[in-house]
């Protein structure tokens, strides 16, 4: 017997779609061998219709595909726009059609239910609105108009022009009779329920002269859209529920084992704590559509998700919904990177951010997740150089190490910096990732003076003390600008043997400015790194003043409050201050503060994805 398994019989109706899932033992050979769907002919030969190698027969062109899911030993054949000609005997299998592992599937496509002649079919999703059209002759214009529902052999009155409304349809049905000359009346039913499904009869007048029209109303719960995303990646649910509910509260919920739906996030401010720091609900557009982004996908995020609208912000029968079935692929293309990075107050962190290596030219961004209301993510820094003003001198985005990873360094840490941050690009949105920064007890490893005042024309020497554990690291000084940190010549003080022995007095790297000029004013970072991987940094501000006869002045830069021109990531990226809403894939008009300077500088912290190992990565 073949170890391949699937449905023995599949039945559907014309115009419908089927999704046939075949299961196979997920051995390494099976996972990577050819998968196929073929039709058995009279001769016994099985003619390939679609295969995992990209082949699609002309009969299936534009309406079928085969997707392999090697990690769980399944492949799925989707066939749309079924016709009765598709009825027949098929095989789903692995390897070669004539020999190899396969399973027999019988597909039967029928015409659909037998309906009275002239029946109009209305196919509508649950929660939506249907308008049933009922024509009549002139002589029945003044007479009673009515809509009945056929239940078995009886007809139950639903609504009529004498103001009767069946209690099951209360507050969601209306009968419209147009002005003179128009020989059609309409019945509009809102917020359709599954129980509204069935055969209806429009009637105008009575007796043998009455006008009748049959309507078959098919109320469907929306077929879940299958969504496959990578572990650690990101998913976006786009939800369009229609103008009728544009001003009603929206939600995303996940169906649980009891077949009820737990709210994940809604526009009333509710959010499931399991998604803290990694979810945003994008403010809706005028048409009522909205989207929800979830990053840092976990295996336990798998399941059926529904978005919907209801004043309570949760699922209620008879309100519109959209559905998805999310699968999280554990054989992820997105590399592991720490989900938690720890730093000490006054110290620094370096965050490694993955991006799609095929998109090395994409713009890179880092934003701070804010949980208020539906969540938002104001951009703090971007690869083109813009840095939020309140982060000046302490935040930098570096292209290194490259090849699918960039680095973000944040120093002068305070407890206010604790929180969730998102790494993203204007390219592949599935590569958005989340990292949490935690501020822990401890002292910074690098010690620099407090803010320094230099005298114009004189020499300034700034020491940076480092502990023995950094003796093998490369030490550097750089001048910070909003486009990075330009490396400067610096010197290790003391002979090399002193470092080998780690002499207490020799752990010093100094920056000398000689002579000091006006252009030297600004932020300087002392840092350590190993190749393209950055360790800790410490920042010092150098103020430059004229030579004074006596006394000295201590200069401290004024830190700006929130930047007025703030960019925010929703599920797209928005600029505040009446700027255009922008999709993160486009960024047509970036606001850039012109500045130059090579990017260098960085920091390393102890990291925790579950352990507290240092953050790693692969160099170019």
């Amino acid at each position: 017997k073949s170890p391949v398994f699937g449905p023995q019989e599949v039945s559907s109706v014309e115009g419908n779609s089927v999704s046939i899932k075949c299961y196979y033992p997920p051995t390494s050979v099976n996972r990577h061998t050819r998968k196929y769907w073929c039709r058995k002919g009279a001769s016994g030969r099985c003619i390939t219709l679609v295969s995992s190698e990209g082949y699609v027969s002309s009969n299936y062109a534009g309406r079928a595909n085969l997707t392999n899911f090697p990690e769980n030993g399944t492949f799925v054949v989707n066939i749309a726009q079924l016709s009765r000609d598709d009825s027949g005997h098929y095989k789903c299998g692995l390897g070669i059609n004539s020999r190899g592992l396969s399973f027999d599937v019988s597909l039967e496509v029928s015409q659909g239910p037998e309906l009275p002649n002239g029946t109009e079919v209305y196919t509508v999703d649950v929660g939506r609105t249907v308008t049933i059209k009922c024509p009549f002759k002139t002589e029945n214009a003044p007479k009673t108009k009515a809509l009945y529902k056929k239940i078995g052999q009886t007809s139950v009155l639903v609504i009529d022009s004498r103001n009767y409304v069946n209690p099951n349809y209360k507050d969601r049905i209306r009968l419209r009779i147009p002005g003179t000359g128009q020989l059609i009346f309409t019945v509009v039913i809102d917020r359709l329920r599954l129980s509204d499904h069935g055969l209806y009869l429009c009637q105008a007048g009575d007796g043998s002269n009455r006008d009748e029209k049959n309507a078959d109303l098919q109320v469907l719960e929306p077929e879940p859209e299958l969504v496959y995303e990578d572990l650690r990646g990101s998913v976006t649910f786009h939800c369009a529920l229609g103008l009728e509910v544009a001003n009603v509260a929206k939600f995303l919920c996940r169906v649980n084992s009891r077949e009820t739906c737990d709210v994940v996030i809604n526009t009333l401010g509710k959010r499931d704590s399991a998604f803290e720091g990694r979810i945003l609900l994008n403010p809706q557009d005028k048409d009522g559509s909205f989207s929800v982004v979830i990053t840092g996908l976990r295996k336990e995020d798998e399941g059926r998700y529904l978005c919907g609208a209801h004043s309570d912000g949760q699922l209620q029968e008879g309100w519109p919904i959209q559905a998805w079935q999310l699968f999280v692929n554990e054989e992820s293309t997105i590399p592991r990177s720490p989900t938690v990075v720890k730093g000490v107050a006054g110290g620094s962190v370096a965050v490694l951010c993955p991006y799609n290596p095929k998109e090395s030219q994409s713009l890179k961004y880092w934003c701070l997740w804010e949980g208020a209301q539906n969540g938002r993510c104001p951009l703090l820094v971007e690869s083109q150089g813009l840095v939020q003003e309140q982060y000046e001198g302490r935040l930098s985005l570096l292209q290194e190490p490259g090849n699918g990873t960039f680095t973000v360094i944040l120093n002068q840490l305070t407890t206010q910096d604790a929180g969730f941050y998102w790494c993203l690009t204007n390219g592949d949105t599935r590569w958005r990732t989340t990292v949490e920064i935690k501020i822990i007890e401890g002292e910074p490893n690098l010690k620099v003076p407090g803010n320094v005042t230099a005298v114009l024309g004189e020499t300034l020497n700034i020491p940076c003390h480092f502990p023995c554990k950094f003796s093998s690291y490369e030490k550097y000084w750089c001048k910070w600008s909003n486009t990075g940190c330009q490396t400067l010549p610096s010197q290790d003080e003391g002979p090399s043997e002193a470092f080998v022995n780690c002499d207490e007095n020799s752990r010093l790297v100094s920056l000398t400015l000689n002579p000091v000029t006006r252009a030297d004013e600004g932020w300087y970072w002392c840092g350590v790194k190993q190749g393209h991987f950055y360790g800790e940094t410490a920042a010092v501000y150098v103020a430059v003043e004229e030579k004074k006869v006596a006394g000295s002045r201590y200069v401290s830069p004024a830190k700006a409050d929130a930047a007025p021109d703030e960019k925010v990531l929703d599920s797209g990226v928005r600029e505040i201050e009446n700027k255009a809403i922008q999709d993160p894939r486009l960024f047509a008009e970036e606001k850039v503060v012109a500045d130059t300077g090579d990017q260098a500088g960085g920091s390393r912290a102890s990291v925790d994805s579950s352990s507290s190992e240092e953050q790693g990565g692969s160099s170019k």
């Epitope: 449905p7 599949v10 039945s11 559907s12 419908n16 089927v18 299961y23 469907l220 084992s257 077949e259």
Partner: nanobody, 129 residues
Framework: EVQLVESGGGLVQTGGSLRLSCAAS????????MGWFRQAPGKEPERDFV?????????????YYADSVKGRFTISRDNAKNTVYLQMNTLKPEDTAVYYC?????????????????WGQGTQVTVSS
């Protein structure tokens, strides 16, 4: 909460037929799966897959059968009654077992009992030789 109630079990001779019913009550989403499993005497707690039915929107059905019952058993559903049936023909003594009805996720492997969320109490089927 979904409740499942089985009926139709009994004693039958080899080669005879039985029709099991499983009535579901409570809220279920329309894309759903229901299956039949059986537990042979002395085989507790093992439940073997017999047949399953997945449906979406009352118009598309997928029927799955264990090799041991292919061609003899037929699974079907009555939409209006929210009931799933298992028609068992040409019964053999090895079909003797407690038959359980289960309800579960439309997307899971229909053969895996752990994938089903709801279970009925079971109905005894005895095939005498």
């Amino acid at each position: 909460e979904v409740q499942l109630v089985e009926s139709g079990g009994g004693l039958v001779q080899t080669g005879g037929s039985l029709r099991l019913s499983c009535a579901a009550s409570g809220r279920t989403f329309s894309s759903y799966a229901m299956g039949w499993f059986r537990q042979a005497p002395g085989k507790e707690p093992e439940r073997d897959f017999v047949a399953a039915l997945r449906w979406s929107n009352d118009r598309t059905y997928y029927k799955y059968y264990a090799d041991s019952v292919k061609g003899r058993f037929t699974i079907s559903r009555d939409n209006a009654k929210n009931t799933v049936y298992l028609q068992m023909n040409t019964l053999k003594p090895e079909d003797t077992a407690v038959y359980y009805c289960a309800g579960g996720n439309y997307f899971s492997d229909p053969r895996v009992d752990k994938e089903y969320n709801y279970w009925g109490q079971g109905t005894q089927v005895t095939v005498s030789s």
